[in-house]
Amino acid sequence: EQAPGTAPCSRGRSWSADLDKCMDCASCRARPHSDFCLGCAAAPPAPFRLLWP
């Protein structure tokens, strides 16, 4: 898994500081209060965030 600050998580994933790894945004349906879900909600759907995080 990528460390924070080195590269973003792949599309559809978001960094979890609690778990110290990238997590699937799809799991926010089941675990909406997880820390990484904030990153999923805020991230634009287009892949531009890979260029301008």
Epitope: G12, D24, A26, S27, R29, A30
Partner: antibody
């Protein structure tokens, strides 16, 4: 290293009861949804029961086939998962797997414990 | 309950070739963003092992020769190139709703 170890299987007569246990190590047990999954030649893999987290008030869900007969529980202080099974019948025979998942999938599996219901 | 139908029930693939396994759900298991379908591998005498979650996302440590695709009701697991250690039974599983259900399995043999 993640480890799930089931125990409590064996031979039981129809109508009898059995309690399965599973001890977990190598991951943050209290942050994982836990389930029991059964495997038999007749029905393949069957999800039986799930228990969620303390923050979910330990919400439980059951397959219709075991509702009212099986009870899932957990002890986070001991990293243990349980399945109390009552009024057992031949169709409950199979390998019982303890499984854990961060969400709605099964990340981790034990090696399974075999339950045989027969007279 | 959602019924998952896998096909074929068994297949034999030559070493280095592609194996394709299908899973059809009796109703959609997808939103506009995500699909709630997993794939597992079970080798003889072993418990199942998670390969892919949410239709396309490889679990950590799973080789890149495994890939998943599909949405709605039709999903596919591809293995390419197939290796000897891939001989196993593969299962799909949905997490759209309770109860979670599994497909009947596809047994992959390597020649």
């Amino acid at each position: 290293e993640v480890k799930l170890e089931e125990s409590g299987g064996g031979l039981v007569q129809p109508g009898g009861s059995m309690k399965l246990s599973c001890v977990a190590s190598g991951f943050t047990f209290n942050n994982y949804w836990m389930s029991w999954v059964r495997q038999s030649p007749e029905k393949g893999l069957e999800w039986l029961a799930e228990i969620r987290l303390k923050s979910d008030n330990y919400a439980t869900h059951y397959a219709e086939s075991v509702k009212g007969k099986f009870t899932i529980s957990r002890d986070d202080s001991k990293s243990r998962l349980y399945l109390q099974m009552n009024n057992l019948r031949a169709e409950n025979t199979g390998i019982y797997y303890c499984t854990g998942g961060f969400a709605d999938y099964f990340d981790y599996w034990g090696q399974g414990t075999t339950l045989t219901v027969s007279s | 309950d959602i019924v998952l139908t896998q096909s074929p029930a068994s297949l034999t693939v030559s070493l280095g070739q592609r194996a394709t396994i299908s899973c059809r759900a009796s109703q959609s298991v997808s939103t506009s963003s995500y699909s709630y379908m997993q794939w597992y591998q079970q080798r003889p005498g072993q418990p199942p092992k998670l390969l892919i979650k949410y239709a396309t996302n490889l679990d950590s440590g799973v080789p890149a020769r495994f890939s998943g695709s599909g949405s709605g009701t039709d999903f596919t697991l591809n293995i390419h190139p197939v290796e000897e250690e891939d001989a196993a039974t593969y299962y799909c599983q949905h997490s759209w709703e309770i109860p979670y259900t599994f497909g009947g399995g596809t047994k992959l043999e390597i020649k």
